[in-house]
């Protein structure tokens, strides 16, 4: 039961995380104008990975896409790439994990196959989460660097008469969404990997010994009630109760008096 819960929770947490990564990638507020000493501004600037926007105090908002590819900073391109890789890996991971879920039966899929798929999706979620965290962190670092550079040049005097105020940018909401989402995806991935351990067939040097008791057909394997995890190929070593196919959790909940040495 714990394995199913861990796997299910890992899937849900990853799903929320990947939805958050997608949302963060699409959001316009990766960087927002710093309102250092002017909390009420008539023109408010904010920027995303794909376009920059200006919101006026009139209520009018204008957004312009970055229609150039070569003219964009390499760091921005790198962040875009990291977020897209994160989304793609996460999406594939979700697809794989759906088929790996214990609560979903697809034909006569083995537990070992489900374990492998769970591990694969878990690793994908971990990498996806790391990509998102890395992307957001690279962007945040870029912002911090630019922030202090623009602070140093805050006022560029022109003949000592006219002042040009440079617009400084600080962390936007998308960064926090990205960090949280990346973290959730990472946690979900770890949970999937933990669940995989509970699903995976255990390697052992012992040979299975069958004990035939009247009215029962029970395959015995050393290792207590984890017997159903089998040896290599899981076909010969499954415990069968009442001739019906049951999940591992169900098998474990009905220990037989014949399971002994």
């Amino acid at each position: 039961m714990a394995v199913t819960a861990c796997q299910g929770l890992g899937f849900v947490v990853s799903l929320i995380g990947i939805a958050g990564i997608i949302a963060a990638t699409c959001m316009d507020q990766w960087s927002t104008q710093d309102l250092y000493n002017n909390p009420v501004t008539a023109v408010f600037n904010y920027q995303g990975l794909w376009r920059s926007c200006v919101r006026e105090s009139s209520g009018f908002t204008e957004c312009r896409g970055y229609f150039t590819l070569l003219g964009l900073p390499a760091m921005l391109q790198a962040v875009r790439a990291l977020m897209i890789v994160g989304i793609v890996l996460g999406a594939i991971g979700l697809l794989v994990s759906i088929f790996a879920l214990k609560c979903i039966r697809i034909g006569s899929m083995e537990d070992s196959a489900k374990a492998n798929m769970t591990l694969t999706s878990g690793i994908m979620f971990i990498v996806s989460g790391l990509c998102a965290i890395a992307g957001v962190s690279v962007f945040a670092n870029m912002l911090v660097t630019n922030f202090w550079m623009s602070t140093a040049n805050m006022y560029t005097g022109m003949g000592g008469m006219v002042q040009t105020v440079q617009t400084r940018y600080t962390f936007g909401a998308a960064l926090f969404v990205g960090w949280v989402a990346g973290g959730l995806t990472l946690i979900g991935g770890v949970m999937m990997c933990i669940a995989c351990r509970g699903l995976a067939p255990e390697e052992t040097n012992y040979k299975a010994v069958s004990y035939h008791a009247s009215g029962h057909s029970v395959a015995y394997k050393p290792g207590g009630f984890k017997a159903s995890t089998g040896f290599g190929s899981n076909t010969k070593n499954k415990k069968i109760y009442d001739g019906g196919a049951r999940t591992e959790d169900e098998v474990q909940s009905y220990p037989s008096k014949h399971d002994y040495v």
């Epitope: 002017n38 008539a42 023109v43 600037n45 200006v54 105090s57 009139s58 209520g59 105020v165 617009t167």
Partner: antibody, heavy 115, light 113 residues
Framework: EVQLVESGGGLVQPGGSLRLSCAVS?????MNWVRQAPGKGLEWVAW????????TYADDFKGRFTISRDDSKNTLYLQMNSLRAEDTAVYYC???????????WGQGTLVTVSS | DIQMTQSPSSLSASVGDRVTITCKSS????????????LTWYQQKPGKAPKLLIY???TLESGVPSRFSGSGSGTDYTLTISSLQPEDFATYYC?????????FGQGTKVEIK
């Protein structure tokens, strides 16, 4: 078509109070009050945020003037307290349109502060 | 606060003349986010409310004759009337639309010579 009609102006003694109203019809963005003293230039008084209803004032009017709105009546208000002789002016309500411009103006209402 | 300085404060011109009014701001009105200069020009006739002419330094408001044009960036801006018409005799104001408090120039009165 946007229409703005001010009312409430008149003669008031120094230290007195007055409330100006601006009836608004048509689609409005954020709203402002702008004034013009006789023979002088234009002076922005206050702005009210269309989303939050939060006001912003020019320094000279903070604490004395209050801009507010009543969405149910489609009316903008300017409550003026502690009036001085130098507050004598024509007060206009104006819509703030794209570009942060005053694209629609009322006809103005004259406020005279005199003893 | 951003100070707006207009020049000249008044000028006399004849119908058909080319008229230029300048406006200087104490800080740049150019917004880096959209590369637009938040400077606006208004025309006001005696006893009337001001009328919007030009916004974003050079964008003509709809219904305004094409003889009016605006230019400039940063801190220096110009309003040009290519061929003055009788109805153009009025007072012209520039306005900072970039930051609060919104500030106006002192005005330029265009009179008949």
């Amino acid at each position: 078509e946007v229409q703005l009609v001010e009312s409430g102006g008149g003669l008031v003694q120094p230290g007195g109070s007055l409330r100006l109203s601006c009836a608004v019809s048509g689609y409005t963005f954020s709203m402002n009050w702008v004034r013009q003293a006789p023979g002088k230039g234009l002076e922005w008084v206050a702005w009210i945020n269309m989303y939050t209803g939060e006001p912003t004032y020019a320094d000279d009017f903070k604490g004395r003037f209050t801009i507010s709105r009543d969405d149910s009546k489609n009316t903008l208000y300017l409550q003026m307290n502690s009036l001085r002789a130098e507050d004598t002016a024509v007060y206009y309500c104006a819509r703030l349109g794209p570009g942060n411009v005053f694209d629609y103006w009322g006809q103005g209402t004259l406020v005279t502060v005199s003893s | 606060d951003i100070q707006m300085t207009q020049s000249p404060s008044s000028l006399s011109a004849s119908v058909g003349d080319r008229v230029t009014i300048t406006c200087k701001s104490s800080q740049s009105l150019l917004n880096s986010g959209n590369q637009k200069s938040y400077l606006t020009w208004y025309q006001q006739k005696p006893g009337k409310a001001p009328k919007l002419l030009i916004y974003w330094a050079s964008t003509l408001e709809s219904g305004v004759p094409s003889r009016f044009s605006g230019s400039g960036s940063g801190t220096d801006y110009t309003l040009t009337i290519s061929s003055l018409q009788p109805e153009d005799f009025a007072t012209y104001y520039c306005q900072n639309a970039y930051s609060f408090p919104f500030t106006f120039g002192q005005g330029t009165k265009v009179e008949i010579k």
